[in-house]
């Protein structure tokens, strides 16, 4: 269920859940918001100061990288 994630616990969870995609500590500008002036929401606000489930955590994963063929 939802839990608070701070410090190393938060980095661990992001690393494991996001994997190859990597992650953001702040959502990119405009991510999930129609207003360019909306304040940036940070994962520390959402997951450390408040409880955070896995789906919320996944919102901070970076987009899929378009990998080039080797």
């Amino acid at each position: 269920g939802p839990e608070t994630l701070c410090g190393a616990e938060l980095v661990d969870a992001l690393q494991f859940v996001c994997g190859d995609r990597g992650f953001y500590f702040n959502k990119p500008t405009g991510y999930g918001s129609s207003s360019r002036r909306a304040p940036q929401t940070g994962i520390v606000d959402e997951c450390c100061f408040r409880s955070c489930d896995l789906r919320r955590l996944e919102m901070y994963c970076a987009p899929l990288k378009p990998a080039k063929s080797a």
Epitope: E3, L5, A8, E9, D12, A13, Q15, F16, V17, C18, G19, D20, R21, L54, E58, L64, K65, P66, A67, A70
Partner: antibody, heavy 118, light 106 residues
Framework: EVHLVESGGGLVQPGRSLKLSCAAS????????MTWVRQAPTKGLEWVAY????????YYRDSVKGRFTISRDNAKSTLYLQMDSLRSEDTATYYC???????????WGQGTLVTVSS | EIVLTQSPTTMAASPGEKVTITCRAS?????MHWFQQKSGTSPKPWIY???KLASGVPDRFSGSGSGTSYSLTISSMEAEDAATYYC?????????FGAGTKLELK
């Protein structure tokens, strides 16, 4: 050198419990998140559970949620998997694993076999 | 979750033969990773990030691909390459492995 040694496997009846252990050495255990991965006989690999470095965060595959509990004792450098309400489909070799960023599932123990049968 | 389908399931190759194992993902992934497992032993990391060989892996191995289609290639089969190979994706939670390709020596 990273060394992971699992123990606690064996034959158990459906519905019963078993607790697996994984003794870690050769690295700073408390700095790393840990996972369990299992492999059913003659089958592929399946991630089972995750626990953060401090033990405060856990994730499970859907089929074991509510039945399995992953935990750790950083003072003893030991990882655990408590398995309750065991089913025949839980029969597998269970591996303790850890990883570095980008080097996924880099380190594996030798595995411990759990057989669930009446 | 992303399903990884490996092909072939089993195959046999003669020494010196070129071998290609494929892994197809049900959705696009950034990279594919490969593991080698020999009977009675733990899986070993073999190829990371689609094409980077893990430490100690012979350079006759290579990896390639993008999107939903990836492959592991052995340029010239040797006896020690007989094993089961698994692909892994870490682009989407939860992590998932392919069912494996068993490579035998002919």
């Amino acid at each position: 050198e990273v060394h992971l040694v699992e123990s606690g496997g064996g034959l158990v009846q459906p519905g019963r419990s078993l607790k697996l252990s994984c003794a870690a050495s050769g690295f700073t255990f408390s700095n790393y998140y840990m996972t369990w991965v299992r492999q059913a006989p003659t089958k592929g690999l399946e991630w089972v559970a995750y626990i953060s470095s401090g033990g405060g965060s856990t994730y499970y595959r859907d089929s074991v949620k509510g039945r399995f509990t992953i935990s750790r004792d950083n003072a003893k450098s030991t990882l655990y998997l408590q398995m309750d309400s065991l089913r025949s489909e839980d029969t597998a070799t269970y591996y303790c694993t850890t990883e570095d960023y980008g080097y996924w599932f880099a380190y594996w123990g030798q595995g411990t076999l759990v057989t669930v049968s009446s | 979750e992303i399903v990884l389908t490996q092909s072939p399931t089993t195959m046999a190759a003669s020494p010196g033969e070129k071998v290609t194992i494929t892994c197809r993902a049900s959705s696009s992934v950034s990279y594919m990773h490969w593991f080698q497992q020999k009977s009675g032993t733990s899986p070993k990391p073999w190829i990371y990030g689609t094409s980077k060989l893990a430490s100690g892996v012979p350079d006759r191995f290579s990896g390639s691909g993008s999107g939903t289609s990836y492959s592991l290639t052995i340029s010239s089969m040797e006896a020690e390459d007989a094993a089961t190979y698994y692909c892994l994706q870490r682009s989407s939670y939860p992590p998932t492995f392919g069912a494996g390709t068993k490579l035998e020596l002919k």
